[in-house]
Structures are given as structure tokens and as C-alpha cells.
Interface confidence: low
């Protein structure tokens, strides 16, 4: 007889979710020398226990502390990039630009790109069947926690210059409730970044407003400002051309107007 | 590492104003905000309100605001906090201070309002 | 704004022993909190900055530690010197709050 299980308003767990994390750990600490010392069965062990048998509306960040501590990395200064409502891209610009690292570049933010998953009180099972939504269900469910947990220790060890990709073509360029806005902005270290450059990244391409100047853009600065953070930000105009020309930084039509620079 | 430092103390009247300097040695002055902090006699220290020369941004506590101004000169890097309305309770020890690594404070300059 | 509550208000200590003063945040400062050392008639010194790296020149019994809300000063074994006020500040936003303060006094 089928237990009953409860209904959550969110898809369930990613089909093959331990198989897929196990494979992309031990993918990653291949390609990534500094990472070899990592043993992939501890990080899914401790991965598993954050959430197996727990009450997937009850997680907490010190569920993960176990996985955080094996998948601790660091990103040189002036190289961690952030973004918000536009991971493809800022995907696309770290894999070109290799000495600049997303979440999802590092260990933990890798294992879980993309995937679902949650269990349920008192069972070793995982649940394939719906995981808790965010809004509709509860804010402390597993992978809202889990991306909460790591985007925090992304941002408290960024040092230098940070940047960050904003989305330009949506109604709130910088948006406080988003991960960045709630907690990466918040957790940026005054003693150790200098400065958060915003990268604006415009959406027509007859689009030349200055999109630095947008409202939501001047609270991100007056935030940033207020944590003893200097701020700029840069309009990228044509998305497609700045990828090419950090592909190809010779191209003669490289050299100006690739981007509008604001100094603030 | 940036040294503060600041104008030398100051008597003044009730309701009179008193400005206070605090000069910036090191480091980029428009780049890291700049706060003023007070410490009245055998009191705890509270924060008046601060500075991002970079951007004339500024902040300033609930309880000082309307009388307190804060200035800065990105061309001497230096940093000024003007009170008003000056009152025997204003009587204190001000500091200038700022994270930079650390947290800098300037030597402090002792304001003393008495008729 | 965030409360700084510090704990306790007098410590009484004798020479050589340890001492343990405790800092509460009323909302995370993550790890931008410093401690202060007072004596009379002095400007505050500052002790420790990000929770827990010490200033330059402070001696290693002075040592910090926690990050969110809730943090701790030690000084392993107390000097006739040590015998201060001490303040916890946070900076992780303007304004900046600091605590009460922290009477270290000899037993």
C-alpha cells in the first residue's frame, strides 16, 4: 500500500538526484585540481543530510554547515561575479572568462544548478513527487535554504572589486527580494570589498537610455553606500557584442562603445 | 594606512554652532565613507551621522537631525561636522572615524558649551 | 536600527584570570563587529575589527569570536592594564550602534 505522502504545490525532486549530484562532484573535482582533495561521497553524504528525514518546511542554514565545510573554496579577489535574474548570461561570460567565477562555477553552487530536491519527516525517502513552492508553501524548504546557505558564503568571502550582472529589461533592475538584493548585497564584507560594480544589461538593441540611473539602481547604491561600499555602474548596451568582444578582445570594434561607464 | 586627523578643541556658547574638521591621510578619501562619533562626559559613544565623499551622500542619526551637517572636501580630503544650536548637553568629545581595513578614528577634538 | 546589548555591565576579575564579555546584535551584523578598550580620560582604542582579527598591536590574549548576532570578547588572562571599559560596535550599517559598555574592575 502507497503511504500517504504530503502534496506540495512545487515539481518534486529531480529525477536521479543523488546519481546526478555524485556525477557532477566528481566531474567537478576532476577538472578542478584544488578540488581533488574532495572525497564525492562525503559531500553527498553531508548533502543528504541536510534535508533526508527532515521536514522539508523546516530546513535551516545550519542543516548544510556540514556541506558547506567540505565544499569550502575561495575566488581570487576582483574575480566573483554575481548576478540576478540573468544566470544565462552570466554563465555564458564566466565560461568564457575563465578567471571569473559565479555560485554555480564553484563546488556547491555546481552540485545543485538547476536541480529540485526535498525528502520527508521520519523517512529515508526522497520525495519525487512535489517539493514545497517558495511562495505557495514555505520560504525554508530545502533548496531555498540550501541557495540562501552558500549564496551568503559567496558573498562574505568576496574580496576586491565584485561584480554583478543585473537584468535590465525587467521592471525592477535591482530587486531587494531576490537573492542578491536580500542577502548577497547584505553579507558583502566592508573590510574586504572595495567596491560592487553593477553591470546593467540592456535588453533592445535600440535601447540607449542610461539605465544606471534607474531608481532601483540608486537604492542598490544607497545600500551598497551605506555598508561602507563603493558602487559604479556600467550600462552594457549590446549583450551579444560584449560576449564577442570578451571573446575576442583584438576585434578593432572592441575598443569603444561596448559598454557606457558610470562612475557614481 | 589612513590617519585621521582632527581641528583642536573648541569652547562655544549655547546656541551657538561649532565646526569640527577631520583631515584624511592615506587611502582614497572619496572612496570610504566617513563617520562622526561623540562621547559626552562619562556617557557611552553614539553614532551623529556620516559622509561618502565620493557622492555628497550623507546620513545623519534621528536625534541630530536639523542640527547636524555633514561636509566633505575631496580636494584637501577632509571631512567636516557642523552642529548647531549648541547646548550644555552637546558638551562631549567628537570623533571621526572609518572602515579601512580596520576602523580609523581621529584623535578626537573636546567641544565644551558653557556660558 | 540595530541594539547592541552587552553583557554583563560589570565583570569582576582578579589578575590573571580569564574574562568573557558577551555582545548581542538585535538583527545579524554577519561579522562586521569591533570591540573597544576605554580608561578614563582616553580615546576608545580599538581591540578587535570583523568579529574577530585584532587590531595591530593589540597582545594575542585579546581574542574575538562569532558572526550573526551573537559574539564574545575573551581576554585570557588579565593584566593590571586591562582593567577598562569595553564597547562592542557594529558597522555593518549605518547608523552605527554600539553597546552600553562592559566594566572590566578588579576583584
Known amino acids: 500500500v502507497p503511504r500517504w505522502r504530503q502534496q506540495w504545490s512545487g515539481s518534486g525532486t529531480t529525477s536521479r538526484f543523488p546519481e546526478t549530484v555524485l556525477a557532477r562532484c566528481v566531474k567537478y573535482t576532476e577538472v578542478h585540481p584544488e578540488m581533488r582533495h574532495v572525497d564525492c561521497q562525503s559531500v553527498w553524504d553531508a548533502f543528504k543530510g541536510a534535508f533526508i528525514s527532515k521536514y522539508p518546511c523546516n530546513i535551516t542554514e545550519e542543516d548544510y554547515q556540514p556541506l558547506v565545510k567540505l565544499g569550502t573554496q575561495t575566488v581570487p579577489c576582483n574575480k566573483t561575479l554575481l548576478w540576478s535574474r540573468i544566470k544565462d548570461l552570466a554563465h555564458q561570460f564566466t565560461q568564457v572568462q575563465r578567471d571569473m567565477f559565479t555560485l554555480e562555477d564553484m563546488l556547491l553552487g555546481y552540485l545543485a544548478d538547476d536541480l529540485t530536491w526535498c525528502g520527508e519527516f521520519n523517512t529515508f525517502e526522497i520525495n519525487y513527487q512535489s517539493c514545497p513552492d517558495w511562495r505557495k508553501d514555505c520560504s525554508n524548504n530545502p533548496v531555498s535554504v540550501f541557495w540562501k546557505t552558500v549564496s551568503r558564503r559567496f558573498a562574505e568571502t568576496a574580496c576586491g572589486v565584485v561584480h554583478v550582472m543585473l537584468n535590465g529589461s525587467r521592471s525592477k533592475i535591482f530587486d531587494k527580494n531576490s537573492t542578491f538584493g536580500s542577502v548577497e548585497v547584505h553579507n558583502l564584507q566592508p573590510e574586504k570589498v572595495q567596491a560592487l560594480e553593477a553591470w546593467v544589461i540592456h535588453g533592445g538593441r535600440e535601447d540607449s537610455r542610461d539605465l544606471c540611473q534607474d531608481p532601483t539602481i540608486k537604492e542598490l547604491e544607497s545600500i551598497i553606500s551605506k555598508r561602507n561600499i563603493r558602487f559604479f555602474c556600467k550600462n552594457i548596451y549590446r549583450p551579444d557584442k560584449f560576449l564577442q568582444c570578451v571573446k575576442n578582445p583584438e576585434d578593432s570594434s572592441c575598443l569603444s562603445g561596448i559598454h557606457h561607464h558610470h562612475h557614481h | 594606512q589612513v590617519q585621521l586627523v582632527q581641528s583642536g578643541a573648541e569652547v562655544k556658547k549655547p546656541g551657538s554652532s561649532v565646526k569640527v574638521s577631520c583631515k584624511a591621510s592615506?587611502?582614497?578619501?572619496?572612496?570610504?565613507?566617513i563617520s562622526w562619533v561623540r562621547q559626552a562626559p562619562g556617557q557611552g559613544l553614539e553614532w551623529m551621522g556620516g559622509i561618502i565623499a565620493g557622492y555628497g551622500a550623507t546620513e545623519y542619526a534621528q536625534k541630530f537631525q536639523g542640527r547636524v551637517t555633514i561636509t566633505a572636501d575631496e580636494s584637501t580630503s577632509t571631512a567636516y561636522m557642523e552642529l548647531s544650536s549648541l547646548r550644555s548637553e552637546d558638551t562631549a568629545v567628537y570623533y571621526c572615524a572609518r572602515v579601512y581595513g580596520g576602523i580609523d578614528w581621529g584623535q578626537g577634538t573636546l567641544v565644551t558649551v558653557s556660558s | 536600527e540595530i541594539v547592541m546589548t552587552q553583557s554583563p555591565a560589570t565583570l569582576s576579575v582578579s589578575p590573571g584570570e580569564r574574562a568573557t564579555l558577551s555582545c548581542r546584535a538585535s538583527q545579524s551584523v554577519s561579522s562586521n563587529l569591533a570591540w573597544y578598550q576605554q580608561k578614563p580620560g582616553q580615546a576608545p582604542r580599538l581591540l578587535i575589527y570583523g568579529a574577530s582579527t585584532r587590531a595591530t598591536g593589540i597582545p594575542a590574549r585579546f581574542s574575538g569570536s562569532g558572526s550573526g548576532t551573537e559574539f564574545t570578547l575573551t581576554i585570557s588572562s588579565l593584566q593590571s592594564e586591562d582593567f577598562a571599559v569595553y564597547y562592542c560596535?557594529?558597522?555593518?550599517?549605518?547608523?552605527?550602534?554600539f553597546g552600553q559598555g562592559t566594566k572590566v574592575e578588579i576583584k
Open positions: 592615506g587611502g582614497v578619501f572619496s572612496q570610504f565613507p
Open positions: 560596535q557594529q558597522y555593518n550599517n549605518w547608523p552605527w550602534t
